[in-house]
């Protein structure tokens, strides 16, 4: 950055190099150039010369004042006009930053995605700070009282191998940056209660010719959790409102769920599961599309990872892949 240049003087910021966004700040420049009594001192922000709010304090020093500074980052440098020098002489430079102290982290959540071998902890960091903000995740065993700390800049994956203090833990998050520090409430967890089953996937759909045609959705999960509760939501693509069906399953077999749908309409389906009676759900699966036939012939549809349609007479259903905001359930 600009802070690496060789200086012939000194530049400093009041109240500080990192300050709260919207503050009034002063940038001072003091020249110390051999055989130069500066005729004029100039300030540059991001390479552009500033023309206003500059005050000469004494022979070697000037001040640039900003009201309500709102830029997250800026590179400042100052120069001097020296007699007998054709070009301006660089005095010094500094990178400055503005932002906010961290909010109190809330909604601390820790889950173990099945087959990941990790406990993943996330939280709501609150408003954007604009400046480098670090988070320390504290994990304290309720059985051994031993505490471990993990430094991160966002979420954290903690290997279950490092959780040697039994199954009950307290987890909390400290947020800190140059402008402040905050700490979340403590979350109490039991490792057996936070496992999210391996992602449920809709694989294909079939509309069967009957007096009332019915659509069968085939879906599955690699989970080895014995008691799993799932929700499947579906709607016509033209609708805003989802219909939701609930299921209890152990995924011994591929699941087959029946729906009585309107003919000649494109529907979208998603599924998600949780270990029965536990708190955390998988994210919704990728979108799966199925168009019901106009009349009675049997239609089999398959899932495709990309948005490609089958040609020919069969109606294609597609799974468009990662359209959900969070597909971490897709492990294993």
């Amino acid at each position: 950055g600009i802070t690496n240049i060789n200086c012939s003087g000194h530049i400093w910021v009041e109240p500080a190099t990192i300050f709260k966004m919207g503050m009034n700040i002063s940038i001072y420049c003091q020249a110390a150039i051999k055989n130069c009594q500066p005729r004029k001192l100039h300030f540059y922000k991001n390479g552009i010369k500033e023309r206003f709010q500059i005050t000469r304090i004494n022979k070697t020093t000037a001040r640039l004042w900003y009201k309500n500074f709102l830029e997250p980052h800026a590179s400042m440098y100052c120069t001097a006009e020296c007699p007998k020098h054709f070009q301006e002489t660089l005095i010094c430079g500094k990178d400055i930053s503005s932002g906010y102290p961290p909010d109190i982290p809330d909604e601390v959540t820790c889950v173990i995605y099945e087959y990941s071998g990790n406990m993943t902890c996330t939280w709501n960091a609150g408003k954007l700070t604009y400046i480098d903000t670090k988070y320390v995740v504290h994990v304290k065993s309720l059985e051994t009282e031993e505490e471990q700390q993990y430094l991160t800049s966002s979420y954290i994956n903690i290997s279950t191998d490092s959780l040697q203090g039994g199954k009950k833990y307290l987890v909390w998050v400290q947020a800190a940056n140059a402008l402040g520090m905050e700490e979340s409430k403590q979350l109490q967890i039991h490792l057996d209660d936070i496992v999210i089953p391996s992602a449920a996937v809709i694989s294909r759909a079939e509309t069967i010719n009957a007096t009332v045609p019915k659509t069968i959705i085939y879906w599955d999960s690699q989970t080895t959790i014995e008691k799993v509760s799932c929700e499947m939501r579906y709607k016509a693509t033209t609708n805003q409102t989802w219909n939701v069906k609930e299921f209890d399953t152990n995924f011994t077999y591929v699941q087959q769920s029946e729906f009585y749908l309107e003919p000649n309409i494109k529907y979208v389906f998603q599924v998600r599961c949780q270990e029965t009676g536990k708190r955390y759900w998988q994210p919704w699966s990728s979108l799966f599309f199925h168009k019901t036939p106009e009349t009675v012939p049997q239609v089999t549809s398959k899932a495709f990872q990309h948005d490609t349609w089958n040609s020919g007479l069969t109606v294609a259903s597609i799974s468009t892949g990662h359209l959900t905001s969070d597909n971490r359930g897709d492990i294993g």
Partner: antibody
């Protein structure tokens, strides 16, 4: 009944590529994950990765990323594994195995790969 | 990756013996463990999943036990057809990993 029939033995030169197959029958092809497992002579088993034909999804052991490529042809119910930039370390028996869970219920008979100049 | 250690690479056994094969994981597997039997020139065969659940068609003289990091495969009365190599496999964490195998050899 469920059957997995793998292609025959391969003798290839170092640096070359090979594509072996695993033809399946006796079950709904899209219902099972197809895994590939490596066994070097007199040694243990190493999981290479799986492919899920229902959505053409793959998951590789990090160690085999760039070495193995898994594909399927749903119409012929066949899974393929291509191995590239072969060295003597790749000489092994390669098994395909199907599963709905992360353990392997049904296995092919294995394909012997010999890499030699 | 999780390391799976089968402490004995081979075992000398007699017909009718009760045989115990052990497998130790580098971390807690929460019972996500399978056992396989492999005979020379053949593919492995699933014996047990979930540390204790017998696979389809597996005879009741085979049983699995254990929890945490330590698991055991037991054969109550060894028969000729049980002479083979036995592998454990973890599925707590991808990549799935196997033990190096324990070979049973007749005395």
């Amino acid at each position: 009944q469920i059957q997995l029939v793998q292609s025959g033995p391969e003798l290839v030169k170092p640096g070359a590529s090979v594509k072996m197959s695993c033809k399946t029958s006796g079950y709904t092809f899209t219902d099972y994950y197809i895994n590939w497992v490596k066994q070097r002579p007199g040694q243990g088993l190493e999981w290479i990765g799986w492919i899920y034909p229902a959505i053409n999804n793959t998951n590789y052991n990090e160690k085999f990323k760039g070495k193995a490529t898994l594909t399927v042809d749903t119409s012929s119910r066949t899974a393929y594994m291509q191995l590239n930039s072969l060295t003597s370390e790749d000489s092994a028996v390669y098994f395909c195995a199907i599963s709905r869970k992360p353990y392997f219920d049904y296995w092919g008979q294995g394909t012997t790969l010999t890499v030699s100049s | 990756d999780i390391q799976m250690t089968q402490s004995s690479s081979s075992f000398s056994v007699s017909l009718g013996d009760r045989v115990t094969i052990t497998c130790k994981a580098s971390e807690d597997l929460y019972n996500r463990l399978a056992w396989y039997q492999q005979k020379p020139g053949n593919a492995p065969r699933l014996l047990i999943s979930g540390a204790t659940s017998l696979g389809t068609g597996v005879l009741s003289r085979f049983s699995g036990s254990g929890s945490g990091k330590d698991y055991t495969l037991s054969i109550t009365s060894l028969q000729t057809e049980d002479v083979a190599t036995y592998y454990c496999q973890q599925y707590w964490s991808i990549p799935w990993t196997f033990g190096a195998g324990t070979k049973l050899e007749l005395k």
